[in-house]
Interface confidence: low
């Protein structure tokens, strides 16, 4: 039998027969930033290159236990889990390892910036096929290193690291907190966040997903037949970019952004025991197991989606929150939540030619967060569409005029403090599926795209009894690109999409004495592509 | 903090001459700002990542560097540079004393100086 | 006090079944690798088997791959050697060895006697 | 396997004098990524388990007499009592852990003359 971390990333689909192609990911080159390593263990042994690269600070001087000449340990076991003969990921990628953590495990911001550049000047001499970066290290928040890792993303490369076994907040951590590097939390054999000691794994927006991370069989640096078991967020990181070199293997010219998209789609939804992490930080954490795609064939022109939450806004009368998409990816709807409810809605606005998707706190609340969803959506033209308070009784409105334009978000901003109990009709005018409607006090924006093949539909969930939640999702086949809530009244926290699912939060009905007036309906905007050939076709 | 490097000496008092009538104001713009890890056992204090601006070629970066040296020797202060970045990020990295962060801020091209950090295995 | 503890031992026929037990105590027990490590009578050292700290990785002698099972339960500290179709050649003081994680031995029990006779 | 061979067999040395066994593995037990020998050396008293003396080749064992050492590299290795007690009568075992299936030596006999 297979160990657990590898058959919990495999499809079923591969389970019954073998676990995966004997040559997966052979297209691709994984640098690998850690300890030293044995490159002659028989599990890596001929797949890895061991670069003359080294930065490492000098070991503390205080003497260590006998464990501590383990120099390899970490790196090797990691190699292992990547492409190892028998316990790896992508058995057929090929990798290279630079030293920067030296053996007590330890290196520094500089060193490891000196290596990143080692590896774009590496890229430059001599270009082979796609490039993965796994950082299976983590300091504290570094703007140098987020910056080095955001060039280093944007001249093509994939980059990969732990999201850190703080037990905290992975924003606060580099370089976990880039928002190019793809995140990864671990979680063990039975999908609960792992503990380690009594910290365990980081959580929050900045994790793009999880990965198995305990109790992980791999290569040990005992001796060149030796396996051992660890844990941490490095060995889940290291699936992940097993998984998104298996991935590039089979479609090399997948960007960053389409690869991070994958990466998500693929994932195990759900699974995550939330209870786990800070309740604070539950809405943030994506609840996402990685897994190999079940074909490592292309997923053909899907409509990819995902969440983006921004930072908090801070509490302040007139903060601010943005939350921003990555430069290959389009904001397709813009939604804002508060824990208070105090908020005054959210907008979107072009920042630095892009659009981006910002939430305004109120005063007396303790912040907001702005939600962007944002989508892979090739040629695309999309443009926000704004109409002021209306200030009637119907409430204010604004759709999607242009030929071939469809609506893919609704957002609503207003200025006074406190929107009334007032209800627009939740209905929309039969024939008019391409407007966004919302209360006649605020300014309602409407996300209006033309793309070939796309199409979009508005699918509404009202309960006439106020509820904390409500919910609606898009069908099989459909992706959720815009969630809003109606009506905007100043009871409703907020709105976002998880996956697929548009969820409207409301205040606890128990303690707002909130009437029927006040009933919510979540509104979700479900698009895909009209017909997968006719759109490659108009692709061309 | 002691310092094995002998050559110290010879490499600032060879720019000494070689950059001491450069001026010493900014460029016109926004001030640089210094950045340092909130974790502060994990912080390496002497050790510094001056960042450029992002259009700074190598021939600029060394030249700030070594004006940063002949600025720091008129003041008796021994500086050595690490490594210069590009490929990436235009920079440089340099073992100096905390004092001379003030000057290092006001140098032309810089856009930020962050404090050697630590980082740590997974 | 940092001990091991075996026992399961006696006299089984050939082709018999036994089951050893290692009782830990006195040291994080999931964190170490353990050990079985047999004597045959008035003869030397002879390693059975090994288990991992986490019970996920499993080395056997070639003497007794596919009859002898190693396993542990981290919630009782506790090591196991099942012990199938038994010979003669098996008859041995059975030892459970604590593994340093490096493959050596630092903490061994007092033994446990197995006798494989008809 | 890597097969360990000891020798002599039996030795018997006066109490206060120097005792020295030795062992010689079938291949390299040194592990270059981290320059240990990966070879320790066992004492096994009548009627009691093993004891572990000596690890990476040349490292005692906390609580063992620094009358005990050992030294060696690659394949041949050597423990030695500098100054042999009464309690010292035992068996002496070295073991190779550079790889599984881990084994010993087939046990030195170590008496007093």
């Known amino acids: 039998s297979i160990p657990w971390n590898l058959e919990r990333i495999t499809p079923p689909r591969y389970r019954a027969d073998e676990y995966q192609p004997p040559d997966g990911g052979s297209l691709v080159e994984v640098y690998l930033l850690d300890t030293s390593i044995q490159s002659d263990h028989r599990e890596i042994e001929g797949r890895v290159m061991v670069t003359d690269f080294e930065n490492v600070p000098e070991e503390d001087g205080t003497r260590f236990h006998r464990q501590a000449s383990k120099c390899d340990s970490h790196g090797t076991h990691l190699a292992g889990v990547v492409s190892g003969r028998d316990a790896g990921v992508a058995k057929g990628a090929s990798m290279r390892s630079l030293r920067v953590l030296n053996c007590q495990g330890k290196g520094t911001v500089s060193g490891t910036l000196i290596g990143l550049e080692f590896i774009r000047k590496s890229q430059l001499v001599q270009p082979v096929g796609p490039l993965v970066v796994l950082l299976p290290l983590a300091g504290g928040y570094s703007r140098v290193l987020n910056a080095a890792c955001q060039r280093l993303a944007r001249a093509g490369v994939v980059l990969v690291t732990a999201a850190g076994n703080f037990r905290d907040d992975a924003c606060l951590y580099s370089p976990a907190s880039a928002p190019e590097v793809i995140t990864v939390g671990a979680t063990n054999a039975q999908d609960q966040p792992v503990t380690l000691g009594t910290l365990g794994t980081n959580f929050g927006r900045c994790v793009d997903l999880f990965a198995p991370g305990e109790d992980i069989i791999g290569a040990s640096s005992d001796c060149s037949t030796c396996f051992v078991s660890q844990s941490g967020t490095s060995q889940a990181a290291a699936h992940v970019a097993g998984i998104a070199a298996m991935m590039l293997s089979a479609e090399p010219e997948l960007t960053l952004a389409e690869l991070r998209q994958r990466l998500i789609h693929f994932s195990a939804k759900d699974v995550i025991n939330e209870a786990w992490f800070p309740e604070d930080q539950r809405v943030l954490t994506p609840n996402l197991v990685a897994a190999l795609p079940p074909s490592t064939h292309g997923a053909g022109w899907q409509l990819f989606c995902r969440t983006v939450w921004s930072a908090h806004s801070g509490p302040t009368r007139m903060a601010t929150a943005i939350a921003r998409c990555a430069p290959d990816e389009e904001l397709l709807s813009c939604s804002s939540f508060s824990r208070s409810g105090k908020r005054r809605g959210e907008r979107m606005e072009a920042q630095g030619g892009k659009l981006v998707c910002r939430a305004h706190n109120a005063f007396g609340g303790e912040g907001v967060y702005a939600i962007a969803r944002c989508c892979l959506l090739p040629q695309a033209n999309c443009s926000v569409h704004t109409a002021p308070p209306a200030e009637a009784s119907m409430g204010t409105r604004v759709h999607c005029h242009q030929q071939g334009h469809v609506l893919t978000g609704c957002s609503s901003h207003w200025e006074v403090e406190d929107l009334g109990t007032h209800k627009p009709p939740v209905l929309r005018p039969r024939g008019q599926p391409n407007q966004c409607v919302g209360h006649r006090e605020a300014s309602i924006h409407a996300s209006c795209c033309h793309a070939p093949g796309l199409e979009c539909k508005v699918k509404e969930h009202g309960i006439p009894a106020p509820q904390e939640q409500v919910t609606v999702a898009c069908e099989e086949g459909w992706t959720l690109t815009g969630c809003s809530a109606l009506p905007g009244t100043s009871h409703v926290l907020g709105a976002y999409a998880v996956d697929n699912t548009c969820v409207v939060r409301s205040r606890d009905v128990s303690t707002t004495g909130s009437t029927s007036e006040e009933a919510v309906t979540a509104v979700a905007i479900c698009c895909r592509s009209r017909h997968l050939a006719q759109a490659s076709q108009e692709l061309q | 903090q002691e310092d094995e490097d002998g050559d110290y000496e010879e490499l600032v008092l060879a720019l000494r001459s070689e950059e001491d009538g450069l001026a010493e104001a900014p460029e016109h713009g926004t001030t640089a700002t210094f950045h340092r890890c909130a974790k502060d056992p994990w912080r390496l204090p002497g050790t510094y990542v001056v960042v450029l601006k992002e259009e700074t070629h190598l021939s600029q970066s060394e030249r700030t560097a070594r004006r940063l040296q002949a600025q720091a020797a008129r003041r008796g202060y021994l500086t050595k540079i690490l490594h210069v970045f590009h490929g990436l990020l235009p920079g440089f990295l340099v073992k100096m004393s905390g004092d001379l962060l003030e000057l290092a801020l006001k140098l032309p091209h810089v856009d930020y100086i962050e404090e050697d950090s630590s980082v740590f295995a997974q | 006090e940092v001990q091991l503890v075996e026992s399961g031992g006696g006299l089984v026929q050939p082709g018999g079944s036994l089951r050893l037990s290692c009782a830990a105590s006195?040291?994080?027990?999931?964190?170490?690798?353990m050990n079985w490590v047999r004597q045959a009578p008035g003869k030397g050292l002879d390693w059975v088997s090994t288990i991992s700290g986490s019970g996920g990785t499993t080395n056997y002698a070639d003497s007794v791959k596919g009859r002898f099972i190693i396993s542990r339960d981290s919630s009782k500290h506790t090591l196991y050697l099942q012990m199938n179709s038994l010979r003669a050649e098996d008859t041995a003081v059975y030892y459970c060895?604590?593994?340093?994680?490096?493959?050596?031995?630092?903490?061994w029990g007092r033994g446990t006697l197995v006798t494989v006779s008809s | 396997d890597i097969v360990m061979t000891q020798s002599p067999d039996s030795l018997a040395v006066s109490l206060g004098e120097r005792a020295t066994i030795n062992c010689k593995s079938s291949q390299s037990v040194l592990y270059r990524s981290n320059n240990r020998n990966f070879l320790g050396w066992y004492q096994q008293k009548p009627g009691q388990p093993p004891n572990l003396l000596i690890y990476?080749?040349?490292t005692r064992e906390s609580g063992v007499p620094d009358r005990f050492s050992g030294s060696g590299s690659g394949t041949d290795f050597t423990l030695t009592i500098s100054s042999l007690q009464a309690e010292d009568v035992a068996v002496y075992y070295c073991q190779q852990y550079y790889t599984t299936p881990y084994t010993f030596g087939q046990g030195t006999k170590l008496e007093i003359k």
């Open positions: 060895a604590k593994d340093s994680n490096w493959g050596n031995f630092d903490l």
């Open positions: 990476w080749a040349s």
């Open positions: 006195g040291f994080t027990f999931n964190n170490y690798a």
